[in-house]
């Protein structure tokens, strides 16, 4: 079985796929409309289930980065030797169970994700076979931002990157040589998953977001578009 | 890979008692780790979640009572305050693999620590 | 509060038979639900994640399947080696909880 560096057993199925093993368009899934009995989602349930599929997404990328290279196997210094400023979730954040502040919180998942983005934008060159999977992780997260503003009530605190130190942080990444960029690809999704984790628990707290729509499929995740909003 | 408790002991109701998890094989900062009891006879009973953000979750029963801290690259404490006989159990430690946010599937256990509460 | 709710306990099955156990929880956790087997004197070990993932080296005459509420683990061709509780686990939420674990089904064979 392959295996990568955080334990995850990756021989589960990539759920955001479709049987003909095409990524779902938006709004395309004919199992979806076949169901009338199910209730419409809320936003909240949309949210978690964005979620979860850009997770699926960024489990299929780590797969192809571990097979690719030896980076998930590298070691705890070979990591640590990173300088990426990648956004993390710290107590300060109130997104953990102790201290947990939906207002803080709210606007630290989003400030990250938003962080988050040029990198997404580093990993779309990095991949061969899984390429779509790139680009949906990135432009669902897009999408997912959205919702999220759309749930925020303090939109003055949320910080937007600024774009020239964005585009040179960029032009930086793509310079390196071949093993720093796989590490950086590595270090990225790693962190991102986590990122992504860390918001989907303190997102699960949050008043209305409590359960999700029972799906005879499991947790099939289909990709939500802008005309979803 | 491997995963080991130790610090079980016979203990008098009140005293408090730190149980360590030590792993082998595993880099703790790349893992999420749960302790997990069980009382004699009785079913598994969920104490808590350390996660690789270093966030940690408790059942609403552990909250205040018990602490679940990484103390090294190799080990995780479970510290217990306030024990009383209810708490006599073997306690487990357990390696996690999360795929979203709290599905945390336990794939490596230790074979537990006896602890014993008693006057 | 999510609460998991195992039945029936304990569950006898015939040797070449099929058992089935059922697991519930009080409210939608999707397929956010693993399922173990534990043996007198041993430690859990993990069958089956995501409802019906299997994990790497437990017999195919495990399966896993549900979602939503209702969960199913049905063990085919039923051993000998087969007695033991098992006990389903929720991963959708662990704020707010007494316990993620249900309270385990015993299956004896006969």
């Known amino acids: 079985d392959y295996k990568d560096h955080d334990g995850d057993y990756k021989d589960h199925d990539i759920d955001y796929k479709d049987d003909d093993d095409k990524l779902v368009p938006p709004g395309e899934d004919s199992k979806d409309v076949a169901a009338p009995h199910r209730q419409p989602l809320t936003s909240s349930e949309r949210i978690d289930k964005q979620i979860r599929y850009i997770l699926d997404g960024i489990s299929a990328l780590r797969k192809e980065t571990c097979n690719k290279s030896n980076m998930c196997e590298s070691s705890k210094e070979a990591l640590a030797e990173n300088n990426l400023n990648l956004p993390k979730m710290a107590e300060k954040d109130g997104c953990f169970q102790s201290g947990f502040n939906e207002e803080t919180c709210l606007v630290k998942i989003i400030t990250g994700l938003l962080e988050f983005e040029v990198y997404l934008e580093y990993l779309q060159n990095r991949f061969e076979s899984s390429e779509e999977q790139a680009r949906a992780v990135q432009m669902s997260t897009k999408v997912l931002i959205q919702f999220l503003q759309k749930k925020a009530k303090n939109l003055d605190a949320i910080t937007t990157p600024d774009p020239t130190t964005n585009a040179s942080l960029l032009t930086k990444l793509q310079a390196q040589n071949q093993w720093l960029q796989d590490m950086t690809t590595h270090l990225i999704l790693r962190s991102f998953k986590e990122f992504l984790q860390s918001s989907l628990r303190a997102l699960r707290q949050m008043g209305d977001l409590i359960s999700v729509p029972v799906d005879s499929r499991g947790s099939e995740q289909k990709l939500i578009s802008e005309e979803d909003l | 890979q491997s995963v080991e408790e130790s610090g079980g002991r016979l203990v008098t109701p009140g005293t408090p008692l730190t149980l360590t998890c030590t792993v082998s094989?595993?880099?703790?900062?790349?893992?999420?780790m749960s302790w997990v009891r069980q009382a004699p006879g009785k079913g598994l009973e969920w104490i808590g979640y350390?996660?690789?953000?270093?966030?940690t979750w408790y059942a609403n029963w552990a909250k205040g009572r018990f602490t679940i801290s990484k103390t090294s690259s190799t080990t995780v404490d479970l510290k217990m305050t306030s024990l009383t006989t209810e708490d006599t159990a073997t306690y487990f430690c357990a390696k996690g693999s999360t795929d979203y946010a709290f599905d945390t599937r336990l794939d490596l256990w230790g074979p537990g620590t006896l602890v014993t509460v008693s006057s | 509060n999510i609460v998991m709710t195992q039945t029936p306990s304990p569950v006898s099955g015939a040797v070449g038979g099929t058992v089935t156990i059922n697991c519930q929880a009080s409210?939608?956790?999707?397929?956010?639900l693993s399922w173990y087997q534990q043996k007198p004197g041993q430690p859990p070990r993990l069958l089956i994640y995501?409802?019906?993932t299997l994990t790497s080296g437990v017999s195919s005459r495990f399966k896993g399947s549900g979602a939503g509420t209702q969960f199913t683990l049905t063990i085919s061709g039923v051993e000998c080696a087969d007695a033991a509780t098992y006990y389903c686990?929720?991963?959708?939420?662990?704020?707010?909880?007494?316990?993620?674990f249900g309270g385990g089904t015993k299956v004896v064979v006969v």
């Open positions: 995501r409802a019906s």
């Open positions: 686990q929720q991963g959708y939420n662990s704020n707010d909880v007494d316990n993620v």
């Open positions: 094989g595993i880099d703790l900062s790349s893992y999420d």
């Open positions: 409210q939608s956790i999707s397929n956010e």
């Open positions: 350390i996660y690789t953000d270093s966030s």
